[in-house]
Amino acid sequence: LEETLLNTKLETADLKWVTFPQVDGQWEELSGLDEEQHSVRTYEVCDVQRAPGQAHWLRTGWVPRRGAVHVYATLRFTMLECLSLPRAGRSCKETFTVFYYESDADTATALTPAWMENPYIKVDTVAAEHLTRKRPGAEATGKVNVKTLRLGPLSKAGFYLAFQDQGACMALLSLHLFYKKCAQLTVNLTRFPETVPRELVVPVAGSCVVDAVPAPGPSPSLYCREDGQWAEQPVTGCSCAPGFEAAEGNTKCRACAQGTFKPLSGEGSCQPCPANSHSNTIGSAVCQCRVGYFRARTDPRGAPCTTPPSAPRSVVSRLNGSSLHLEWSAPLESGGREDLTYALRCRECRPGGSCAPCGGDLTFDPGPRDLVEPWVVVRGLRPDFTYTFEVTALNGVSSLATGPVPFEPVNVTTDREVPPAVSDIRVTRSSPSSLSLAWAVPRAPSGAVLDYEVKYHEKGAEGPSSVRFLKTSENRAELRGLKRGASYLVQVRARSEAGYGPFGQEHHSQTQLDESEGWREQLA
């Protein structure tokens, strides 16, 4: 990109540049018309018979450099061939010299700075590539010369350009002073500002376009070359923020349309809202869930919205004493999620009718919640209690939903409790034909013990016909008609209103061999 500092073709008034010295044969300003009939100005000089050592100087007005370090001067000029000039002497030249002088203000006068090299800085001696021939009475013919010179480095606020003629017959048709700058550029969603190069290459920091964010890595930069071109170099640029997608050749970020979203910054375009969600505004990074639908905290922002599951179905219970096996079917509606688990709530009602949440004496296997399989075993049920189990299905969004959690209930009533097994049987007396036994009264939860049943048989005689039973209302009994010196196995069970409890452990006792031993008290 070129920024013009001066273009004589565009000047609408006289240039009125300064000439030196004030003598005949000096540079003179002429006017003409371009193709559009706009007035243009040119300078001519033709002192081919000048005195030796005489130079004609022409100096432009003061030109602010506007931050440029190097300025380019494009000269358009014609040069008469010395041979075409009948009066041309040996001093006729076909070259001229260009100088510049820097200053911080428009301080030059008709006499200062001194009209010579140093203080003026020589740029170049310009020779004509094309010479114009002129025959008397005929029109001059010849091509226009175009020469671009480079001035600098410049450091002061402005400068003057000067032309020194030492015997040429020439016309300076136009002067274009300009500097080169790198035009504002947007690439990879990164905007690089218009930059005037101060060196061969200048690093330029970029900034993200509106609604873009820096990509990971080094901050984006590009190099502005002295010729006003951006150096070709891959740019770690910016990317569109969440809710925006790249558009117009990666130069802008466009808001996602209604009904679409983009959850993350970076490449990629806006996507339609996932199932059960919507976006009512443009620029959505996330789509809002429909009423009753949710995203778990761990769900990606782009995941569909889901809902809690319906209740489990068809709970089947199998009671086995104080143990209960519950089994059920998966809910009809999973809510659109895979993370389905089950949980149980439990209430117990005593025989008297008072109900409360189940106590800590119940155990659940594998557990009361976070069940992944549709079954559970409950142990430690108390007899003659009614239990209500509510089986619920849960998923990752159940905790976000308000309102009651659907469940499938099951009621189970346990049998009334029989007395516990009788243990601690001891022999209080033994004889060759009898055994006197006693035991501790078991604690019967459902009422008192009504009576006991004693079951005994001789050791070794295992058949059912050898087993004998004896009922007693006391917590003792005497077994008669036993064999002398024989071993017997004895079991006792208690009966309450709920029925017989289980037989206790077999107790081993032995009758006496003869009478002489007399009655002997034995400890169990």
């Epitope: 006289d14 009125k16 018309l33 007035s39």
Partner: antibody, heavy 126, light 108 residues
Framework: QVELVESGGGLVQPGGSLRLSCAAS????????MSWVRQAPGKGLEWVSA????????SYADSVKGRFTISRDNSKNTLYLQMNSLRAEDTAVYYC???????????????????WGQGTLVTVSS | DIELTQPPSVSVAPGQTARISCSGD??????VHWYQQKPGQAPVLVIY???KRPSGIPERFSGSNSGNTATLTISGTQAEDEADYYC???????????FGGGTKLTVL
């Protein structure tokens, strides 16, 4: 001898026409930009019209635009001013004048008039 | 376009310096040319490009131009210098030109 000589002036009625001529000699006419300048009796100079060396560009003062036409015949070294719809206020001495010439480039001219004719009187009266 | 204003008349004693002004908006940014016209004669260019003298014009004629005013100076005025003097510049309207109203110089 470098000179410009005007002719064609005279008495003409309002609304009438007149054609002025200016014969050039002693310089390369086809390299010169030319103008007409007039001077009403007892008044100052007033620029009227101009033409470039090749004759393709012309310019007029607002007071004569649309009524006067400047032209040139480079083969005859002659400049013309065709005056139509003449008015009493057009009464003046009409001078042919040459713009300062370029050394060799007839596309350009200096902004002063460096050569004048002796003038020709045009009287518009009924 | 620019309008040039001159004093109608200036008087000067022989041998003294006569100054004739020509004013216009930002005139210093334009070139001004001066013409001398004696009664019954065609104008003659006496100063061009503000301060340059054509060959054949006496050195007592000089010119300057800055700000809004151009000045023609005749130092050591002579009786033969009595004439009308006109300033002129060009206008932006293509090849248009404009003259000042003229100043009658009387040498007393």
């Amino acid at each position: 001898q470098v000179e410009l000589v005007e002719s064609g002036g005279g008495l003409v009625q309002p609304g009438g026409s007149l054609r002025l001529s200016c014969a050039a000699s002693g310089f390369t006419f086809n390299n010169a930009w030319m103008s007409w300048v007039r001077q009403a009796p007892g008044k100052g100079l007033e620029w009227v019209s101009a033409i470039n060396a090749k004759g393709q560009f012309t310019s007029y003062a607002d007071s004569v635009k649309g009524r006067f036409t400047i032209s040139r015949d480079n083969s005859k070294n002659t400049l013309y001013l065709q005056m139509n719809s003449l008015r009493a206020e057009d009464t003046a001495v009409y001078y042919c004048a040459r713009k300062g010439m370029s050394f060799y480039n007839n596309k350009y001219a200096k902004s002063m008039f460096d050569l004048w004719g002796q003038g020709t009187l045009v009287t518009v009266s009924s | 376009d620019i309008e040039l204003t001159q004093p109608p008349s200036v008087s000067v004693a022989p041998g003294q310096t006569a100054r004739i002004s020509c004013s216009g908006d930002n005139l210093g940014k334009k070139y001004v040319h001066w013409y001398q016209q004696k009664p019954g004669q065609a104008p003659v260019l006496v100063i061009y490009y503000d301060s340059k003298r054509p060959s054949g014009i006496p050195e007592r004629f000089s010119g300057s131009n800055s700000g809004n005013t151009a000045t023609l100076t005749i130092s050591g005025t002579q009786a033969e210098d009595e004439a009308d003097y006109y300033c002129q510049t060009w206008t932006l309207s293509h090849m248009g030109n404009v003259f000042g109203g003229g100043t009658k110089l009387t040498v007393l």
